[in-house]
Amino acid sequence: VLPAKPENISCIFYYEENFTCTWSPEKEASYTWYKVKRTYSYGYKSDICSTDNSTRGNHASCSFLPPTITNPDNYTIQVEAQNADGIMKSDITYWNLDAIMKIEPPEIFSVKSVLGIKRMLQIKWIRPVLAPHSSTLKYTLRFRTINSAYWMEVNFTKEDIDRDETYNLTELQAFTEYVMTLRCAPAESMFWSGWSQEKVGTTEEEAPYGLDLWRVLKPAMVDGRRPVQLMWKKATGAPVLEKALGYNIWYFPENNTNLTETVNTTNQTHELYLGGKTYWVYVVSYNSLGESPVATLRIPALNEKTFQCIEAMQACLTQDQLVVEWQSSAPEVDTWMVEWFPDVDSEPSSFSWESVSQARNWTIQKDELKPLWCYNISVYPVLRDRVGQPYSTQAYVQEGIPSAGPVTQADSIGVKTVTITWKEIPKSKRNGFIKNYTIFYQAEDGKEFSKTVNSNILQYRLESLTRRTSYSLQVMASTNAGGTNGTKINFKTLSISVL
């Protein structure tokens, strides 16, 4: 059988290294050797490359080497496949070296900010040594912030006459570390160099970008003062490296600025004690270069009716996220504040919050929350400066079986009845939503019975027991992950009724 006709010929010119062609099929059933015929010097000269020996047989690739690699040039290539039965020739293909030239990557030697020019990095590089001197090179500059996985790209060209191998990358974030990598190719070529080694640079620091501001309103104290826990953090989009030297807070009752109080702190939280009126609170952060824009918060009067617009809320889990969605009756509300914290028996040690805009859902990566912990999630509607009634739900990112079963006791033991009561498992040991309880009971040497009740039931009366009989009993609490038995108890039914 004749060899297959060589097809899909693809050639690439590795500048000053070789000119390599590949083709298909890569493997033949019988031993096949290949001859690649070439014309070069604009058709004036010809030569061949061959896989004519056993070590290279069936390799669908051949390389032409210097000194006959001429550039610029047009090459003609034809591949012949030969086996014991005969020869098959490919179609003739034509290659303009400028269009298939691949050169070495450039080498970035500095990525620096330029004094006084904000949000810009100047990249300097060394043009690859193995690149045609006179050609215009096109470049792709890839860049990303150091903690991001997503690359952005910018394309540009440089004439050889420029000799100025620099590029000013603008519209960056202030005081942010960027990773840069660069590739290049002759302007006419379809083949890019590899990427250069990555280099890191940091944009100049500026005055702080801004703050996100929130509060927790606590119940009024006996003397009528209201504790308000203020909290703030760098605004979304602020530079990762940004550091504030401190924070200035000032606040006053609505329409009474001459009662302004000021506080300076280096913390990101501060407790205010306010009267029952409406208050306005302002916070700025500052560093050596200036102040951030002002973050503003209105604290409603104690007796103010807050609006309610969230009608329902659902929390669901995807493969790697917790997604909370809500429905609202107020289309004009497009900003929401989400709070989340662990539902523990003691004061929550960690309290988190985040603003959501132009969406009615909020997502968080599962790995940002602890498995087996119940989280309280509240969503507040925010309409301009007004904060509405929150809607709350609870969620686990991963449920497990309870760490302990219910503590059970037998009450009101009768001749044929007994009332079983059990305590709720402490929050820290539930490891999931308790969906039901199952009571297992068994007379001495008798058959085991069970009864399952809803999670809101903590007491159950067993009937139709046998008089004057010893029973063992335990209650199992179950989550979606499974159940855990409580301590086993024993009781004995009475022989006669006791009134």
Partner: antibody, heavy 131, light 108 residues
Framework: EVQLVESGGDLVKPGGSLRLSCVAS????????MSWVRQAPGKGLQWVSG????????GYADAVKGRFTISRDNARNTVYLQMNSLRAEDTAVYYC????????????????????????WGQGTLVTVSS | EVVMIQTPLSLSVSPGEPASISCRAS???????LVWYLQKPGQSPQLLIY???SRATGVSDRFSGSGSGTDFTLRISRVEAEDVGVYYC?????????FGQGTKVEIK
């Protein structure tokens, strides 16, 4: 037997045209470049034009550039020389010659240098340009 | 174009004597692209030497070639009667390919 047979030579008036043909046999025609070489009466050899195996023109002598055109038909194993605007100084025996084969000169490994020469020649065809 | 100058233009040699023909190029030529041909009286030219020094199939070892750059030489160690004819050098390095003007070898 490897053979080249030229035809088409004739007596033609200045400014006239002529097409020479060279039929090849005994070898795989499309593996080889072909050339036309001429020899004026009592003079030396002059390379006229050449065509590579792929059908690309190798070039023309300065004296014939713009007037002569070389071509090949691999299906017919034939190379042609179209001669226009003929002049008295084009009078010569025109030889068809085969370029060296695409082999030889193994450099070691898989790459082969190509040495250039005309290894097979036809018997020639006479072109006379005269009024 | 590259001009090839042969010297001498004619050469009369006694049988058994050596002979030498020089070919000088107007610019450097790669040794791979320098060829010698012999045209015997009344015949088409035939290949003698290619790549400056490689003998063509069937060519006597009395013929040898050498040189590089712009100066190339063809030597016949012992001339025989069958060696008469015109010897041409040719370069392939640049277009157009060009021949020397020829050297006529005769037997004394």
């Amino acid at each position: 037997e490897v053979q080249l047979v030229e035809s088409g030579g004739d007596l033609v008036k200045p400014g006239g045209s002529l097409r020479l043909s060279c039929v090849a046999s005994g070898f795989t025609f499309d593996d080889y470049g072909m050339s036309w070489v001429r020899q004026a009466p009592g003079k030396g050899l002059q390379w006229v034009s050449g065509i590579n195996w792929a059908g690309g023109t190798i070039g023309y002598a300065d004296a014939v550039k713009g007037r002569f055109t070389i071509s090949r038909d691999n299906a017919r194993n034939t190379v042609y020389l179209q001669m226009n605007s003929l002049r008295a100084e084009d009078t010569a025996v025109y030889y068809c010659a085969r370029e060296s084969p695409l082999r030889l000169g193994d450099l070691g490994g898989d790459y082969f240098y190509y040495y250039y020469y005309l290894d097979v020649w036809g018997q020639g065809t006479l072109v006379t340009v005269s009024s | 174009e590259v001009v090839m100058i042969q010297t001498p233009l004619s050469l009369s040699v006694s049988p058994g004597e050596p002979a030498s023909i020089s070919c000088r190029a107007s610019q450097s030529v790669s040794s791979r692209y320098l060829v010698w041909y012999l045209q015997k009286p009344g015949q088409s030219p035939q290949l003698l030497i290619y790549g400056t020094s490689s003998r063509a199939t069937g060519v006597s070892d009395r013929f040898s070639g050498s040189g590089s750059g712009t100066d190339f030489t063809l030597r016949i160690s012992r001339v025989e009667a069958e060696d008469v004819g015109v010897y041409y050098c040719q370069q392939y390095d640049n277009s157009p390919r060009t021949f020397g003007q020829g050297t006529k070898v005769e037997i004394k």
